[in-house]
């Protein structure tokens, strides 16, 4: 077989057609997509493309420039009339660049055999493209049958002379692929047996996926497999100030394009996800943990002065339980429980009390009673010591009511009930709760039990009770409690010497209900049973006593 | 009661250098940002600088920048503005004011200043 | 830099009456619905003293009679009825991005 070596094809003006056809076709270059990496774009190239052509008179290049005085390379053949035409034009070294799966994109013009006169015997519409791997940059003299075929090229598209009069172009684009590719490099060859060709453009790139960031991971520029089905499997890595809980692939498909992806990062505590990147949080924001999507203000009752911070700071007089998360606001101990009353029975106390006015902001309220023994003369207190039982129980009441038995007859007795929260352990402030000081009694006051109501306005209620059948002892005051019924909650406490009291800033008509007990030296009585009397209406008169049975 | 008490100025040659400090009480140093803010004879507030609590943020004025350091030691309750290369346009007094904790902060407490005379 | 433009730069007004202040901010100073706006008031030879925050907060201990309002770059600091210890000067500040930037300060006198 003959030798493809041979010396550079001289450029020789080119007919007409070629040059209308070439300066109309080329002025189109588009640019390449941003997942083909070219080898070779034969039209920017700037110099000598260092081309070969065997046997010289075959293929011979056309020294054309385009509208910015580009050299244009173009190739053309048209040996129609001749028979037996073998015609090669062999590229220089084309190196992969570690492809091993390349594209080669030809852009040519055929002429129709039909419309030459003469040559239809041995005129062609199809020429033959090869390619022949090497490591070599100098190892073009090579043997045609060492040349791999990689097709047979027909043009879509061919012209004839009409076509040719009217300027109108017909440049066909083929693409073909070779692959697997295992040496560093290649040559391309294009065999002529009897067209009329004109060879605008050769282009040979591979395919990659572009670099990427998707879900904050950064996946590199990843060349495509050879085999055409091929999925690549490619590890991302994590963005600045990201992590990740599953290291995050994706899949880079045959045709340059990032499929299936898997895993993710995330912006870690203290950053947050903005156009692609973890940014900082700002003084003032906080992020607890990578799985929170963004900064999110501080709490109620802190703060942060800090880039990046993960929790923020209490702020005076606030805490936080280690339990409590991040994001909840800080809290402060309750204030002191209110109206506290107290109900002795010989030697047990019940005392009862409402939450107070201030829970700190917290859920978790109970209650610790402390019990002090005191000695009415000296004035000194003591603890009350073991032998005193708390019904239910002393500390984490959630009640609003405790029970103590067992106490000593005729003793004046302290209680203070304080009230606790999640944070009171973390305050060295001052304790907070209310006292009630009692006097055990075997015998306190009976209750009260005949009560008159007197004047009735729309705003008050007078009543008049009388003492209590069994005083036990000279009757020191009286307790009034009373609330508007069906708010037992929210009640008022009256005292009075007498028995008689008006009760004043009422609402008008309503019901409220009363509830009297006396106290002597020896301690309160039980309360009386509940005595419901309504105020009046805006513009009712008013109303004057009846006895209530 | 929080106070904020500032020292170490005084007349200084241009290109010299001064140490400033501010002595916190009253409140947890550790946890506030604190800026110092100049203020020239007769002219408006300036902000020079901040540094966060733990040291972790800090920022500067353009005016200032690769001149001035701010600095804090917590163990001391103190902050510092280090002052390099003086020019006379940094006469003023000097003020350092804690960040507040009700958000957006501003600066809550101001010390009565420290005065800075920078003069051949 | 965001430059802070205040306006007037003083101004005289009667005992009693409503002063108005008025400052500008080179671009917005809000960020995630709030406003990063701060006023100070001065005395001569005394420290500032921050009044409001937020654009629109009052500082605790500070009287009600100052308030503040705005958002984005148009911002107005109010007394609605001048007392004599408000003679002062007073600031501006956006803290929204460092440099935190001060306006140039307005002189207020008691007609």
């Known amino acids: 077989p003959a030798s493809l070596a041979g010396c550079y094809s001289a450029p020789r003006r080119a007919p007409l057609w070629t040059c209308l056809l070439l300066c109309a076709a080329l002025r189109t270059l588009l640019a390449s997509p941003s997942n083909e990496v070219n080898l070779l774009d034969s039209r920017t190239v700037m110099g000598d493309l260092g081309w070969i052509a065997f046997p010289k008179n075959g293929w011979e290049e056309i020294g054309e420039v385009d509208e910015n005085y580009a050299p244009i390379h173009t190739y053309q053949v048209c040996k129609v009339m001749e028979q037996n035409q073998n015609n090669w034009l062999l590229t220089s070294w084309i190196s992969n660049e570690g492809a091993s799966r390349i594209f080669i994109e030809l852009k040519f013009t055929l002429r129709d055999c039909n419309s030459l006169p003469g040559g239809l015997g041995t005129c062609k519409e199809t020429f033959n493209m090869y390619y022949f791997e090497s490591d070599d940059q100098n190892g073009r003299n090579i043997k045609e049958n060492q040349y791999i075929k990689i097709d047979t090229i027909a043009a879509d598209e061919s012209f004839t002379e009409l076509d040719l009069g009217d300027r109108v172009m017909k440049l066909n684009t083929e693409v073909r692929d070779v692959g697997p590719l295992s040496k560093k490099g290649f040559y391309l060859a294009f065999q002529d047996v009897g067209a009329c060709i004109a060879l605008v453009s050769v282009r040979v790139y591979y395919k990659k996926c572009p670099s990427v960031v998707r879900h904050l991971a950064v996946f590199p520029d990843t060349i495509t497999g050879a085999d055409s089905s091929q999925l690549l499997e490619v590890s991302g890595s994590c963005v600045n100030h990201s992590v990740t809980d599953e290291p995050p692939k994706m899949h880079c498909s045959a045709e340059g394009e990032w499929l299936v992806p898997i895993g993710k990062c995330m912006c870690k505590a203290g950053y947050e996800e903005k156009n692609g990147t973890c940014q900082v949080c700002r003084p003032g924001f906080f992020k607890a943990s990578p799985h929170i999507q963004s900064c999110g203000k501080c709490p109620p009752h802190s703060y942060t002065h800090e880039e990046a911070s993960t929790s923020c700071v209490c702020e005076k007089d606030y805490f936080r339980r280690e339990s409590d998360p991040p994001t909840m606001a800080c809290t402060r101990p309750p204030s002191a429980p209110r109206n506290a009353i107290s109900n002795v029975n010989e030697t047990s106390v019940f005392l009862e009390w409402i939450p107070p006015a201030d829970t700190g902001g917290r859920k978790d309220v109970s209650y610790y009673i402390a019990c002090k023994k005191c000695n009415s003369h000296a004035g000194v207190c003591e603890e009350c010591g073991g032998h005193v039982r708390y019904l239910p129980r002393q500390s984490g009441l959630k009640n609003t009511s405790v029970m103590m038995v067992d106490l000593l007859a005729h003793t004046n007795y302290t209680f203070e009930i304080e009230a606790v929260n999640g944070v009171s352990d973390l305050s060295p402030g001052a304790r907070q709760y209310v006292s009630v000081n009692v006097t055990t009694n075997q015998a306190a006051p009976s209750p009260v039990t005949n009560v008159k109501k007197g004047k009735i306005a729309k705003n008050s209620i007078s009543l008049s009770w009388q003492e209590p059948d069994r005083p036990n002892g000279i009757i020191l005051e009286y307790e009034i409690k009373y609330f508007e019924k069906d708010q037992e909650t929210s009640y008022t406490i009256i005292k009075s010497k007498e028995t008689t009291i008006t009760a004043e800033g009422l609402k008008p008509a309503s019901v409220y209900v009363f509830q009297i007990r006396a106290r002597t030296a020896a301690g309160y009585g039980v309360f009386s049973r509940r005595f419901e009397f309504e105020t009046t209406p805006v513009f009712a008169a008013s109303s004057d006593q009846s006895q209530i049975p | 009661e929080v106070q904020l008490v500032e020292s170490g100025g005084g007349l200084v040659q241009p290109g010299g250098s001064l140490k400033l400090s501010c002595a916190a009480s009253?409140?947890?140093?550790?946890?506030?940002?604190i800026h110092w803010v100049r203020q020239a004879p007769g002219k408006g507030l300036e902000w020079v600088a901040y540094?966060?609590?733990?040291?972790?943020?800090?920022y500067y004025a353009d005016t200032v920048k690769g001149r001035f350091t701010i600095s804090r030691d917590n163990s001391k309750n103190t902050l510092y503005l280090q002052m390099n290369s003086l020019r006379s346009e940094d006469t003023a007094m000097y003020y350092c004011?804690?960040?507040?904790?009700?958000?957006?902060?501003?600066?809550?407490?101001w010390g009565q200043g420290t005065l800075v005379t920078v003069s051949s | 830099d965001i430059v802070m433009t205040q306006s007037p730069g003083s101004l005289a007004v009667s005992l009693g009456e409503r002063a108005t202040i008025n400052c500008k901010a080179s671009?917005?100073?809000?960020?995630?619905?709030?406003?990063?706006m701060n006023w100070y008031q001065q005395k001569p030879g005394k420290a500032p003293k921050l009044l409001i925050y937020?654009?629109?907060n009052l500082e605790s201990g500070i009287p009600d009679r100052f308030s503040g309002s705005g958002s984005g770059t148009d911002f107005t600091l109010t007394i609605s009825r001048l007392e004599e210890e408000d003679a002062a000067s007073y600031y501006c500040?956006?803290?929204?991005?460092?440099?935190?930037?001060f306006g140039q300060g307005t002189k207020l006198e008691i007609k």
């Open positions: 004011a804690r960040y507040g904790t009700s958000f957006p902060y501003g600066l809550d407490y």
């Open positions: 009253g409140f947890t140093f550790s946890t506030f940002g």
């Open positions: 937020g654009a629109s």
């Open positions: 500040q956006q803290s929204n991005e460092d440099p935190f930037t």
């Open positions: 671009q917005s100073v809000d960020y995630d619905g709030d406003s990063y």
């Open positions: 540094i966060s609590g733990a040291s972790t943020t800090i």
